[in-house]
């Protein structure tokens, strides 16, 4: 028996379902009484889900896995994995023993959204040209970790002077604090953009200074 | 071109345990299913137990159970059965052989275990 | 746990003759059913799989039949290198477990 699966990773946002793709050829003349299906996590070797004996065991892993019933005498031994959570990423080993045995693994990469940043000036009145500021921009809720950039009105890099700190929450979800300094000229536009690895999903905010008052774009 | 090499012959006292080791080189050793069959002198062949290294799951015949232990190394390559509180009838051949392609295809040398006092 | 049982125990042949032997489960195994041949002082060796599918370089002359609870291994005509002790075995499903039958005795008459 060969098990094949899919090379590259399956990525699922949290919250939603993913299917962990994994196919046989059966002989012909196969039945279900002959296989013994086995998913498990790769690196611990904990169980997740098994078919054994000619009938579905069940989720070994938190009641949140489904095998596919009708589709396993096709040769299709995918699983689906239940509300995703962030815990779930990694490597599983889908296993098929019929007379012979092989296995293969396949890799979960969970992803979350971030949020539209905010953003914050310290100290936010009575701003003169040649004031240090502090400009936050805060972006919630995502995963993995975030890369953040910030640049001027001339879209020119600020590297400077930047503090990130990421902070993963009780559900393995990050949020994201970046801090610039920067000494304020005349006028000018900064802004920050957080980016998901991952999903390739950019989440932009920006603070423009005209003098006084300050002004905040819009939130798109 | 896969190989299982035993461990060398071993001499015990009564009471006491044995460590075979059985080391694969070529194919994957993670893919393999490893059991331990042994034979007494003059004697048929007896399935002691085996184990699937990537499942690292052992079972072990019921006559057996709770004297030996089928442990892997995926990091060697190399599959090992213990037998605790030995007595003169353990004194046999025990072979290591491979599950592939719905039969043991592929044998270790065998390492003869004498237990005397 | 299935037994398996195989007869004769001995069986006295000439090289040349037809070599029959038999090995019956206690009950039915499907077709998981593999032959083995084992010379003194040597290891086992595959003959057949999947009850008669021949395993690789083993010669033509070996054969095997059957399924369920009765199995053959038919050697069409002996030579001299195939006196040696035949072991049949077969594996329960899950968990995998394994069981040889007693073993027949192939010598020259």
């Known amino acids: 028996v060969e098990v094949q699966v899919s090379e590259d990773p399956v990525v699922a946002l949290v919250d939603t379902d993913a299917t962990l793709r994994c196919s046989f050829s059966p002989e012909p003349g196969f039945s279900l009484a002959q296989l013994n299906l086995i998913w498990q996590l790769t690196d611990t070797k904990q169980l997740v889900h098994s078919f054994t004996e000619g009938r579905d065991q069940g989720s070994a892993y938190s009641n949140r896995t489904a095998l596919f019933p009708d589709l396993l005498v096709q040769g299709n031994a995918s699983l689906r994995l239940q509300r995703v959570r962030v815990t779930d990423e990694g490597s599983y080993t889908c296993f098929v023993s019929i007379q012979d045995f092989d296995s293969a693994a396949v890799s979960l990469q969970v992803a979350a959204p971030y949020s539209k940043p905010s953003m914050t000036l310290e100290p936010n009145k009575d701003l003169r040209p040649g004031n240090m500021v502090t400009i936050t921009c805060s972006s919630y809720q995502g995963y993995p970790e975030a890369e953040v950039f910030w640049k001027d009105g001339q879209g020119v890099p600020l590297t400077g002077n930047v503090t990130t700190s990421q902070m993963a929450n009780e559900r393995g979800l990050f949020d994201v604090h970046s801090v610039l300094r920067v000494v304020l000229g005349a006028n000018g536009t900064y802004s920050c953009l957080v980016r998901n690895p991952v999903l390739q999903q950019d989440a932009h905010g920006s603070v423009t200074i005209t003098g006084q008052p300050l002004t905040f774009p819009p939130e798109a | 071109q896969v190989q299982l090499v035993q461990s060398g012959a071993e001499v015990k006292k009564p009471g006491s345990s044995v460590k075979v080791s059985c080391k694969a080189s070529?194919?994957?050793?993670?893919?393999?299913?490893i059991s331990w069959v042994r034979q007494a002198p003059g004697q048929g062949l007896e399935w002691m137990g085996g184990i699937i290294p990537i499942l690292g799951t052992a079972n072990y015949a019921q006559k057996f159970q709770g004297r030996v232990t089928i442990t892997a190394d995926e990091s060697t390559s190399t599959a090992y059965m213990e037998l605790s509180s030995l007595r003169s009838e353990d004194t046999a051949v025990y072979y290591c052989?491979?599950?592939?392609?719905?039969?043991?295809?592929?044998w270790g040398q065998g390492t003869m275990v004498t237990v005397s006092s | 746990e299935i037994v398996l049982t195989q007869s004769p125990g001995t069986l006295s042949l000439s090289p040349g003759e037809r070599a029959t032997l038999s090995c019956r489960a206690s009950q039915s195994v499907g077709g998981y059913l593999a032959w083995y041949q084992q010379k003194p002082g040597q290891a086992p060796r595959l003959l057949i799989y999947?009850?008669?599918n021949r395993a690789t370089g083993i010669p033509a002359r070996f054969s095997g039949s059957g399924s369920g609870t009765d199995f053959t291994l038919t050697i069409s005509s002996l030579e001299p290198e195939d006196f040696a002790v035949y072991y049949c075995q077969q594996r329960n499903n899950w968990p995998p477990m394994y069981t040889f039958g007693q073993g027949t005795k192939l010598e020259i008459k």
């Open positions: 052989a491979r599950w592939g392609g719905g039969a043991f295809d592929i």
């Open positions: 999947d009850a008669s």
């Open positions: 070529g194919g994957t050793f993670s893919s393999y299913a």
